[in-house]
Each structure stands twice: as structure tokens, then as C-alpha cells.
Interface confidence: low
């Protein structure tokens, strides 16, 4: 009203949605009697009577506040329960006596929004887009008043930037009067943003002060063209025949291009496409020397149809060929000499070793083994091992059998066998020579012959012990083109009172076996042979 003194600013009361606002009438006793007060709400400059106080007794007026108002503090304070956003307005109390005075209260209402929900653009963003593309959407539900949103990339706040960053925010009012904020971040991204972390932050106020809530961090799929492709080979290092080798294409683009792996044909020098598995990996299993060669990868961008070629990768599958020994089946007279030569091809430097097959003893380090003044003991197996020292496990071997001409040579000349009458005896007799001998027995029984190796034969005889057999004994005779030789087996009855050390006390003498003792075939040569190596 013109001429009146300017009204003082209303008192500010701040509360959270759902709580109770205490509206204290600030009229002094001189300004009015608090036992006679009218309370009004002011909305859009329209006053509505909501509560009367008479003689200190309160009475709600019909309307929106009817159920939520009560008098407190001996009539000085009006309590408004279950505050809603719609209650954000001015409330005034008016004293009637001695003259009409009023006191105004501004009610401010607050509600923290829910945790912000961030959704990344699932379709992704190409780096070469002409204008900012949608990166992510942030939604903050049920806040009051409208919270403020800030977008972050790698922990740094993003500002609007012409043609680069655009933040588009909108809000809706729920039936409760609370706000839901939706903010869309649009940006032009670069390749380096493929690992960038984006999140949104909601800033809001409560009676207790300023607060904020952060969304989770998200990365957005960024599509950028491939600039280079390259090949990767596993395992790393020297490869050998038999290995499982994987050749894969890699590219620095997203999405990766369509890969094909080619190998240069050594004859035509043309690149020929190889068949890869479902993952685009060329698996060589087992790897062979033929897999060696120059490989390259082609990456084809199916959108632009631009093709990129990798730098060629030279693949070497190391190998050792079949080992050849000459002579392949040597035969020599006793006293003569023999030179064994070993040959093999490899992609790397080879190391040769000659081993005695029966003992594993290393006889020579090198491709040539010379044997002089051959004795019959020198007959038997010799193994050449061709290996690549720099690649563990890469080796090939060949066994050669040396035959020394000579008449049969018996494993034993004579032997005593303890027996019991009427037992079935199992006898064995072994002989060697070249040509390989045959064995005959001087008694009837069931005999069987087994070739032990090219120069050695073993004959076993099952025979019943009779008094006649005890008297005559048993002889086995080995013969070949160069002569014959005999072994004698003396049979003696077991005297149960005087068991000799030769008697078999563990088996109850159900059988007796006459056979040669195990022996190491030593080889006579001109050099002192090295001790067997520990080949761990």
C-alpha cells in the first residue's frame, strides 16, 4: 500500500519432504495477542485462511491443510506435518488485537534425488562424425528442487563447447511434485576416448547444506578406422616341428577389420589365403617344416572397403629330417674295422651323437663312428641321434644293427640246476652269432625258440624230471654256417636237509629256470670309451 513502510523479508524455514515444518509466529506481544491469531497460506498472491487461534485454542479451516496442522508451544507455533513440494510457499500469521499485524514465513522444501542412473549409448560413436553424438544419458529421479547435473570425463568436468560438447537437460514433474531430471551428453569423440571414463554428478541442496551424488563410470564404444594391422605368432621364440603354432591378425581399429591370413607360395611368389578358425586364428598343429615361409595379414574394412596389409612375418618351423646311417645293415668279420656315418638335414646347425643301444653309453660326438678290431661283443645296436642344441626336444634318431660273423657263442658253458623228481622243468638256453644260430636239445620235450635280436636266439624247453634225465643231464646245441657250440645243464636232486645256496627256497621249487645272467655288451674299440652320461 503506498505510503506504508516496506515489509521485512519473510523468515526462512527449510525442511525435507515428508518431515514436519514448525511455523513460529514471530509477532511480539506489543504487535498482537497470540491467543487471537489467524494463519494464512499465500499462493500466487492469493491468501487462504487455513487456521484460527481463539483464546489459545486452535481450529483448522476446511481444505488441503485440514488434517496436517496442529498448535504447539502454547499457541506460538503452528506445526505442518508430511510436508510436500506443493507446501513451498509463504505462510503468515495475523494478530487481531490491539490492531491487525502480520508475520510472514517462507517455507522451503528439499528432497535428495535418487542415485543417478547412467546409460551409455550402446550403438557406439564413430570418431569422424560431423557433429556431437549421444554419448550417455543420466537420469536423476525424485529430487526437489531440480538438481544440477555435471558431466565428467576421466575425472574432469565437461563444459559446453561449440561443435564439440553439448549437454541437453530436461525435467519432468511427477504427480508427487518431485522432479526427474534427464541429461544427455553429446560429444565429438576421438580415438583416444576409447578408454575414457564418463560419469554424471547430481548437485542438490538439503537443509543441512549442499550435497552431490555420482553415477557409476562408463566407457562408450568408440569406432575408429584401422591404421595398421600386424601378425602375432605364439609361442614366442624358436618353433619346431610338432609344436602347436597360432598365427593371429591384430589391428588398431574398432571394430577390427575382416582378417585374412596369406602365405607366400615359394614357387609362384604369390600370396595364397590360409584357412583360419572361427576366431580368425591360423592354427598349425602339428607344425611342419612346410609351414615355414612369409605370412601376411590383410585387414578389410567392410564399411569403407579399404584394405590394409600387415608387414610380412617370416615363420621358421625348425626341423630335423629322417636320419640316414650308412652302411644300413653292416656285417663284419672279427678283427676288422667299421665306419658308421650318420646324415640328416635341418634348418639349424645339427649335433650328432652315437650311442650304444643296449647301455645308452655315448660312444662318439659327431656324425662318424669308427670301430676297430671288432670283437663279437661289438655286435648289436648303435643309435645315431641328430639334434639341434639350441631347440630342446628337436631331434631324430636311427638305429643300426652291426653283425659280426662268427660261430655260435653261448651265454654259458655249463650250469647246475637243482630239481625234484617228477617236476616239470623249464630250461632256457641263449646263443648268439652271425648268421643267427638255431638251437637244438638232446632230450625230448616241448621246445620253443624266440629271436631276441638279429644275432641272438633264446630257446626254452619244458621237460619232466625222470631218473634217466638226472643221469644223462641236458645239452643245448647252437649251430650256424660257421660252426656249432654246446651248453650243458647238470641236474641234481634237492636234498631237503642240506639246502644249498643255489636252491630256490622261495618258490618251493615248482620250476627251475636255467638262463644266462644279464650282461652288458661292452664294445672293444681303440679309444677308452666315456662313462655313460647323465641325460636328465
Amino acid at each position: 500500500v503506498p505510503g506504508e513502510a516496506e515489509q521485512p523479508a519473510p523468515e526462512l524455514v527449510e525442511v525435507e519432504v515428508g518431515s514436519t515444518a514448525l511455523l513460529k509466529c514471530g509477532l511480539s506481544q506489543s504487535q498482537g495477542n497470540l491467543s487471537h491469531v489467524d494463519w494464512f497460506s499465500v499462493h500466487k498472491e492469493k491468501r487462504t485462511l487455513i487456521f484460527r487461534v481463539r483464546q489459545g485454542q486452535g481450529q483448522s479451516e476446511p481444505g488441503e491443510y485440514e488434517q496436517r496442522l496442529s498448535l504447539q508451544d502454547r499457541g506460538a507455533t503452528l506445526a505442518l506435518t508430511q510436508v510436500t513440494p506443493q507446501d513451498e510457499r509463504i505462510f503468515l500469521c495475523q494478530g487481531k488485537r490491539p490492531r491487525s499485524q502480520e508475520y510472514r514465513i517462507q517455507l522451503r522444501v528439499y528432497k535428495a534425488p535418487e542415485e543417478p542412473n547412467i546409460q551409455v549409448n550402446p550403438l557406439g560413436i564413430p570418431v569422424n562424425s560431423k557433429e556431437p553424438e549421444e554419448v550417455a544419458t543420466c537420469v536423476g529421479r525424485n529430487g526437489y528442487p531440480i538438481p544440477q547435473v555435471i558431466w565428467y570425463k576421466n575425472g574432469r568436468p565437461l563444459k559446453e563447447e561449440k561443435n564439440r560438447v553439448h549437454i541437453q537437460s530436461s525435467q519432468t514433474v511427477e504427480s508427487s511434485g518431485l522432479y526427474t531430471l534427464q541429461s544427455i551428453l553429446k560429444a565429438q569423440l576421438v580415438k583416444e576416448d576409447k578408454d575414457a571414463q564418463f560419469y554424471c554428478e547430481l548437485n542438490y541442496r538439503l537443509p543441512s547444506g549442499n550435497h552431490m551424488k555420482e553415477s557409476r563410470e562408463v566407457t562408450v564404444p568408440v569406432f575408429y578406422p584401422t591404421e595398421k594391422v600386424w601378425l602375432e605368432v605364439e609361442p614366442v621364440g624358436m618353433l619346431k616341428e610338432g609344436d602347436r603354432v597360432e598365427i593371429r591378425c591384430l589391428a588398431d581399429g574398432n571394430p577390427p577389420p575382416h582378417f585374412s591370413i596369406s602365405k607366400q607360395n615359394p614357387s609362384t611368389r604369390e600370396a595364397e589365403e590360409e584357412t583360419t578358425n572361427d576366431n580368425g586364428v591360423l592354427v598349425l598343429e602339428p607344425a611342419r617344416k612346410e609351414h615355414s615361409g612369409r605370412y601376411e595379414c590383410q585387414g578389410l574394412d567392410l564399411d569403407t572397403m579399404i584394405s590394409l596389409l600387415s608387414e610380412p612375418q617370416e615363420l621358421l618351423v625348425n626341423y630335423v629330417s629322417d636320419v640316414r646311417v650308412s652302411p644300413a645293415a653292416p656285417e663284419r668279420q672279427e678283427g676288422s674295422s667299421l665306419t658308421l656315418t650318420c646324415e640328416a638335414e635341418s634348418s639349424q646347425d645339427l649335433e650328432f651323437q652315437w650311442l650304444r643301444e643296449e647301455t645308452g653309453q655315448v660312444l662318439e660326438r659327431g656324425p662318424v663312428l669308427q670301430l676297430h678290431d671288432l670283437k663279437r661283443e661289438a655286435g648289436g645296436g648303435y643309435r645315431c641321434v641328430a639334434s639341434v642344441p639350441s631347440i630342446p626336444g628337436l631331434n631324430r634318431t636311427q638305429l643300426v644293427n652291426v653283425a659280426i660273423f662268427g660261430p655260435p657263442w653261448m651265454a654259458f658253458k655249463e650250469r647246475k640246476v637243482w630239481v625234484k623228481e617228477n617236476m616239470v622243468l623249464n630250461l632256457s638256453c641263449e646263443a648268439s652269432g652271425h648268421p643267427r644260430p638255431t638251437i637244438s636239445w638232446n632230450v625230448n620235450g616241448t621246445a620253443s625258440e624266440q629271436d631276441q635280436d638279429p644275432q641272438r636266439v633264446l630257446s626254452t624247453l619244458n621237460v619232466l624230471v625222470t631218473p634217466e634225465l638226472l643221469e644223462t643231464g641236458v645239452e643245448c646245441t647252437a649251430s650256424n654256417d660257421l660252426g656249432k657250440n654246446t651248453s650243458i645243464l647238470f641236474l641234481e636232486l634237492v636234498n631237503l636237509t642240506t639246502l644249498t645256496p643255489d636252491s630256490n627256497t622261495t618258490t618251493g621249487l615248482s620250476t627251475s629256470t636255467a638262463s644266462p645272467h644279464t650282461r652288458a655288451n661292452s664294445t672293444s674299440t681303440e679309444r677308452k670309451l666315456p662313462e655313460p652320461e647323465s641325460r636328465g
Epitope: W230, P235, E311, Q313
Partner: antibody, heavy 120, light 107 residues
Framework: QVQLVESGGGVVQPGRSLRLSCAAS????????MHWVRQAPGKGLEWVAV????????YYADSVKGRFTISRDNSKNTLYLQMNSLRAEDTAVYYC???????????????WGQGTTVTV | DIQMTQSPSSLSASVGDRVTITCRAS??????LAWYQQNPGKVPKLLIY???TLQSGVPSRFSGSGSGTDFTLTISSLQPEDVATYYC?????????FGPGTKVDIS
């Protein structure tokens, strides 16, 4: 035996140019990607540049991009590093080194030269 | 670009001790990692390539492990000649950055 020998180092004023050479012997130079690596006094190793076996691919460290050029002459078994617009921070021992399996995206550098000193 | 970090920056150990140096890449580099040894006043020497493959001629007390972002160089029994600075280097894609180095000496 396999050997790399650098040359061409010296004292130069800032802003000037220098060309380093690396002579290779004992292996098939034209089959291997080659690198330049440098080491400032009392500091660690810094990779400078690489060139593919045939010279078609070249990559540089950000600190030298646009100022240094790597090249090779396979007929002379020689690797080069042309250094322009030299700065005080380019002062270092420069080594040339060979890629272990000969390709650019490789697994290591197995043969190194003794290095040549550049003082700016 | 991918950054390479090494820890510790220096260490002191006794002869015969087991020594472990770690190298970390800011992004995955599969097994494209090499380890070098540089003795005082000498040229760098390749010890390990492909993260775990021992270069020929390197004593077996050196070993490497790891894949992706975390890698380890181990000296199983430190010897006087192992006093040096050790560097890791990534080879996944250019630039082929070195780690800052770890100085090893004998206490």
C-alpha cells in the same frame, strides 16, 4: 660376428642438424627391422625410432616426431638417423639396435652398437 | 600412449639373494615385453623377450613372467656381475616405450 657400429656423433649448436650412421655386418641386414635408442647422461633408455626391413614402415617417439628421420640403405648395410632442429634435450648417447626376429612389432632388440655421443 | 612403470626404482641385496623387479603397463600389452640389463658404462643387453623367454647365452638364474599389464623379472640368486640397471620395454605397438629402470646393487 654380428656387429653394429655407430658414427656421426659430435658437438652441435641448438637448431642445427646432424646425421648418424650405423654400419651392420655379420648378418643379413636387409631382413631385419632396425631401431635407434638414446640415453641422456645419467638417465634411462629412451626409444627414438624404428624402420622396417624394407624401409616401408617408420615410427617415431613423440619427442622427435617431425624433427628426426630414420632411413636405411640395404645395399650398403647402413642405417641412418637424420636429426634436424636439435635441442639441448637431444644430448645423449645414441645406439642402433636390431629387432630380434626382424619385424617391427617384435619382442626385443638383441644386438646393440656401442653408441655414438651427440652433444647439443 | 601406453606408459610403463617399474618398481622399485633401486634396490640393494646380498649375493645369493632372490631379487624381484616389477614392470607395469598402463594398458594390456599381452606378452610383448622385453627386459634388458645395462651394466655400468656398458651397452644394454637383452635378457628376456616375449615376457618369459630367456635370450640365448643368458644365465638361467634370470627369469621373466607375466602377461597383460603386470610383469616380473626375477634373479633367483644374485651374483656380483648382476650389479646393473634393468629396464623393461613394451613392443605391443609403437612407440616402444622403456620403463624408467631399476638400479640393483650389492649391499
Amino acid at each position: 660376428q654380428v656387429q653394429l657400429v655407430e658414427s656421426g656423433g659430435g658437438v652441435v649448436q641448438p637448431g642445427r642438424s646432424l646425421r648418424l650412421s650405423c654400419a651392420a655386418s655379420g648378418f643379413t641386414f636387409s631382413s631385419y627391422a632396425m631401431h635407434w635408442v638414446r640415453q641422456a647422461p645419467g638417465k634411462g633408455l629412451e626409444w627414438v625410432a624404428v624402420i622396417s626391413y624394407d624401409g616401408s614402415n617408420k615410427y617415431y617417439a613423440d619427442s622427435v616426431k617431425g624433427r628426426f628421420t630414420i632411413s636405411r640403405d640395404n645395399s650398403k648395410n647402413t642405417l641412418y638417423l637424420q636429426m634436424n632442429s636439435l635441442r639441448a634435450e637431444d644430448t645423449a648417447v645414441y645406439y642402433c639396435a636390431r629387432s630380434i626376429f626382424g619385424v617391427v612389432i617384435d619382442y626385443g632388440m638383441d644386438v646393440w652398437g656401442q653408441g655414438t655421443t651427440v652433444t647439443v | 600412449d601406453i606408459q610403463m612403470t617399474q618398481s622399485p626404482s633401486s634396490l640393494s641385496a646380498s649375493v645369493g639373494d632372490r631379487v624381484t623387479i616389477t614392470c607395469r603397463a598402463s594398458q594390456g600389452i599381452r606378452n610383448y615385453l622385453a627386459w634388458y640389463q645395462q651394466n655400468p658404462g656398458k651397452v644394454p643387453k637383452l635378457l628376456i623377450y616375449g615376457a618369459s623367454t630367456l635370450q640365448s647365452g643368458v644365465p638361467s638364474r634370470f627369469s621373466g613372467s607375466g602377461s597383460g599389464t603386470d610383469f616380473t623379472l626375477t634373479i633367483s640368486s644374485l651374483q656380483p656381475e648382476d650389479v646393473a640397471t634393468y629396464y623393461c620395454q613394451k613392443f605391443s605397438s609403437p612407440p616402444f616405450t622403456f620403463g624408467p629402470g631399476t638400479k640393483v646393487d650389492i649391499s
